[in-house]
Interface confidence: low
């Protein structure tokens, strides 16, 4: 039977819900899938189920709720129906389903190189997703940076931070690294998708050193 797969709000102002459509794989003809929702006024459900306002904008098998239909303080229940029967139901508050878009504009600068020339420290910077209203404090994002050598499979995770830059220490010179960052709404929701990978190549010692050092 069709099931909700994910509800997500990228910026606490809109949200969308997606579901699987396995009608064609099963033997049972379920008929068209419809999504209905209800919102709660303070302690009470309105008891009025309304149909999805927009089946198109978030893609196939989805319902999109624009800012007119979204309130972070009011809990929602949604249900999928087919032939008049409920096939799946889910309740949540918008704050619970916040998953920000990936951070953007990742770049790095060299901080320093160890005396031995074997290790280097870098500063990684990025920007919050464009649709996250950081300035007015509507969203407070925390970020998690991960990095690894290109040929490794396991990512090293850094502790979550609230700033949009972080130093990464003791990287090996002559190695290429991959760096990625993801974010979440502080105190609620889940981490969003990772940013595009930033490649960091640390050149050899001789390229960091001034000629004067050899005299």
């Amino acid at each position: 039977e069709p099931k909700f797969t994910k509800c997500r709000s990228p910026e606490r102002e809109t949200f969308s819900c997606h579901w699987t459509d396995e009608v064609h794989h099963g033997t049972k003809n379920l008929g068209p899938i419809q999504l209905f929702y209800t919102r709660r006024n303070t302690q009470e459900w309105t008891q009025e189920w309304k149909e999805c306002p927009d089946y198109v904008s978030a893609g196939e098998n989805s319902c999109y709720f624009n800012s007119s239909f979204t309130s972070i303080w009011i809990p929602y229940c949604i249900k999928l129906t087919s032939n008049g029967g409920t096939v799946d139901e889910k309740c949540f508050s918008v704050d619970e389903i916040v998953q920000p878009d990936p951070p953007i504009a990742l770049n790095w600068t060299l901080l320093n190189v160890s005396l031995t020339g074997i290790h280097a420290d870098i500063q990684v910077r990025w920007e919050a997703p464009r649709n996250a209203d950081i300035q007015k404090g509507w969203m407070v994002l925390e970020y998690e940076l991960q990095y690894k050598e290109v040929n490794e499979t396991k990512w090293k995770m850094m502790d979550p931070i609230l700033t949009t830059s972080v130093p990464v220490y003791s990287l090996k010179v002559d190695k290429e690294y991959e760096v990625r960052v993801r974010s979440k709404q502080r105190n609620s929701g889940n981490y969003g998708e990772f940013s595009e990978v930033l490649y960091v190549t640390l050149p050899q010692m001789s390229q960091f050193t001034c000629e004067e050092d050899f005299y």
């Epitope: 006024n41 302690q43 459900w45």
Partner: antibody, heavy 123, light 107 residues
Amino acid sequence: EVQLVESGGGLVQPGGSLRLSCAASGFNVYYSYIHWVRQAPGKGLEWVASISPYYGYTSYADSVKGRFTISADTSKNTAYLQMNSLRAEDTAVYYCARYYYWSGGRFSAIDYWGQGTLVTVSS
Amino acid sequence: DIQMTQSPSSLSASVGDRVTITCRASQSVSSAVAWYQQKPGKAPKLLIYSASSLYSGVPSRFSGSRSGTDFTLTISSLQPEDFATYYCQQYWFSPITFGQGTKVEIK
């Protein structure tokens, strides 16, 4: 300071009536959700009824539906519980409590309770 | 109606003990769960709201957590004034429902 003071409890015969009052101070009843919650001797807590003057909404537990009426006089900042056709099983301490939904908090809960008033239904 | 199944119904503990009380909701109630403390002859007092938020003025030894439909109240180090009855409550659906209560007694 937020305060809720119940009054109107007492001894009443089965089938009789009582009207409980809940005088509020320190906040506006209009922008609140006022609940009546009862506790039978030695038992747990049971929600009885609620009113939201702002939404114009009232709600009742099945056990009291049709017998109890909740109301509010916002000019007096007071809520009431009119109890008719009282039964022995309605014997309990009745608390009024508030849920203040303009507090801005996510799912802020019932945060203030009155001291309670005892209703005894007995012949 | 949503059932809130609270356990244990009573427990004996000593001052300094770590105490855990659990509540299971019969279906999803999001994070709309509160915990109250009640002493004999007194009104309940709010300890935790929104499953894990500590109400103002409540000592930090009290904490709440949520895992799906399971909710937990933890007292990290029981104090003499903590001997009381504790109730969980869901306020996601109407009617609001309470757990049966857990009486914490002195061992």
